[in-house]
């Protein structure tokens, strides 16, 4: 069996840093053999058998001129083996952030905070904290750790599912390279790392005969439980075309009427989410939609709320996106709000 | 014991393309080097190039790197020297030797190569 | 191209008696020199590598040193089968080289 232990990384390579002493192997003799290096390309012996020192190889203060592939042969001259030495750093610890888009998942994401420039993999787990009783000094089997499955498509992301809103975890990410291995711990709790998507599937329609409103509505985002414990609450911002400044209304529901805006003139609209309860953070906004109110005159008779109307002049603004998703049943919440007529 | 035996005399006409070969046994041919090497009459060693043992990688003097061709072929332990575009100057004895990277250590019996119209 | 030049070209001794080859390369190579005998009709025979460390199966009357440039091959005391063409090896660079050789002839 070889004398060298293997690194994790491709076979044949061997690793060592930049500025220090790095050992080289020969790995096809038995420990301690005398064997010679050559450097691959070049015929002039590098370090003979009678060096001292066995099957391996010493290069002082390697730089990256070192870098490359050796030879090494046994005394009678049979090919030892060739090995290339590659340089790089110790990792460092990653820099790691977790994410939730609702309330029963959440992901990491990370990224290496000091390029090593050798392969490099993670491992990634994590536990649920738990305070226990004074007596009792073990770790509960039910707290982990587990791993967190990372994505197969080899993005630097990992996904708890099914977590507890109400429980803390300590996610571990640890960053290996054949030089070592460095680990990040990160507490988490759902309640403060929860950003929901934005809502989906924006409209807005002019309302006939009325000049100066608009209706917005929207759906929950698809990434939101279907049958939701926690509700969502929303935030819509408008603005006329050329004006700088959003307007900013908190709606009860999944729709909004807008009473103030500018006659004629397009309007952008967005929208954003978040827990009802105030936990984590508002989403981005949602895509901008836009509508203009209609010019038509006030009909004689104003049709039920939410049916489509058939526009008397100009037929209503949608956003550009495909029709959404039918949404979530309204929630208790959700009322209706219009301006007095 | 080691032995590397090579293939026996070739007359050759200038501009033509010779192909020597050595038969190695008594050892694991793919753990060494085969170098080839010529000696003119009268003259001294010229080394022409060496091919790698397992993965035949080989390494040729610039003087013969455009009408030499070296290979091996594992499964017969056999060693090929081809030169090409033959001028009479090329007339020596060829020898293919087992070595490490850059030593020769045994020798084929030589193969005569004469070039001559 | 490394130039190895050997001298003697030819050196008439006779049996029992010290010979001194040399050679010298044209930049330095530090130990990269090895030493082969030839005698007529037979393949050269590996001697001494890198300048002085010796061969199995070789006799201890040969020996081999220097570094650098200047490299000598001494055989203390001749048997009548040391009698033969030397020659020097280079590695260390492509390609590798051989010095002219020195004829070593009874006298």
């Known amino acids: 069996s070889s004398p060298c232990p293997q690194a994790w990384g491709p076979p044949g390579v061997q690793y060592g840093q930049p500025g220090r002493s790095v050992k080289l192997c020969c790995p096809g003799v038995t420990a301690g053999d005398p064997v010679s290096w050559f450097r691959d390309g070049e015929p002039k012996l590098l370090q003979g058998p009678d060096s001292g020192l066995g099957h391996e190889l010493v290069l002082a203060q390697a730089d990256s001129t070192d870098e490359g592939t050796y030879i090494c042969q046994t005394l009678d001259g049979a090919l030892g083996g060739t090995v290339t030495l590659q340089l790089g750093y110790p990792p460092a610890r990653p820099v790691v952030s977790c994410q939730a888009a609702d309330y029963e998942n959440f992901s990491c994401t990370w990224s290496p905070s000091q390029i090593s420039g050798l392969p490099t993999r993670y491992l990634t787990s994590y536990r649920k904290k738990t305070v226990l009783g004074a007596d009792s000094q073990r770790r509960s089997p039910s707290t982990g750790p587990w791993p967190c499955p990372q994505d197969p498509l080899g993005a630097a992301r990992c996904v708890v599912h099914g977590a507890e809103f109400w429980s803390q975890y300590r996610i571990n990410v640890t960053e290996v390279n054949p030089l070592g291995a460095s680990t990040r711990l990160l507490d988490v709790s759902l309640q403060s790392i929860l950003r929901p998507d934005p809502p989906q599937g924006l409209r807005v329609e002019s309302v006939p005969g009325y000049p100066r409103r608009l209706r917005a509505s929207w759906t929950y985002p698809a990434s939101w439980p279907c049958q939701p414990h926690f509700l969502l609450k929303f935030r819509l911002q408008y603005r006329p075309a050329q004006h700088p400044a959003w307007s900013t209304v908190e709606p009860a529901g999944l729709e909004e009427v807008i009473t103030d805006a500018v006659a004629g003139l397009p309007h952008a609209v967005r929208v954003s989410a978040r827990d009802f309860l105030d936990a984590g953070t508002w989403s981005t906004w949602s895509p901008e939609a836009w509508g203009t109110p209609s010019t038509g005159t006030i009909p004689k008779e104003i049709p039920a709320w939410g049916q489509l109307h058939t526009q008397p002049e100009v037929e209503p603004q949608v956003d550009s996106p495909a029709p959404p998703r039918p949404s979530l049943q309204p929630h208790p919440r959700l009322l209706d709000h219009r301006d007095s007529v | 014991q080691v032995q590397l035996v090579q293939s026996g005399a070739e007359v050759k006409k200038p501009g033509a393309s010779v192909k020597v070969s050595c038969k190695a046994s008594g050892y694991t041919f793919t753990n060494y080097w085969m170098h080839w090497l010529r000696q003119r009459p009268g003259q001294g060693l010229e080394w022409i190039g060496n091919i790698g043992p397992s993965d035949s990688k080989t390494h040729y003097n610039q003087k013969f790197k455009d009408r030499a061709t070296l290979t091996v072929d594992k499964s017969t332990s056999t060693a090929y020297m081809e030169l090409s575009s033959l001028r009479s100057e090329d007339t020596a004895v060829y020898y293919c030797?087992?070595?490490?990277?850059?030593?020769?250590?045994?020798w084929g019996q030589g193969t005569l190569v004469t070039v001559s119209s | 191209d490394i130039v190895l030049t050997q001298s003697p070209a030819t050196l008439s001794l006779s049996p029992g008696e010290r010979a001194t080859l040399s050679c010298r390369a044209s930049q330095s190579i530090s130990n990269n020199l090895h030493w082969y005998q030839q005698k007529p009709g037979q393949a050269p025979r590996l001697l001494i590598k890198y300048a002085s460390q010796s061969i199995s199966g070789i006799p201890a009357r040969f020996s081999g040193s220097g570094s650098g440039t200047d490299f000598t091959l001494t055989i203390s005391s001749l048997e009548p089968e040391d009698f033969a063409v030397y020659y020097c090896?280079?590695?260390?660079?492509?390609?590798?080289?051989f010095g002219q050789g020195t004829k070593l002839e009874i006298k």
């Open positions: 090896q280079q590695s260390y660079s492509w390609p590798l080289t």
């Open positions: 030797a087992r070595g490490d990277y850059v030593l020769f250590t045994y």
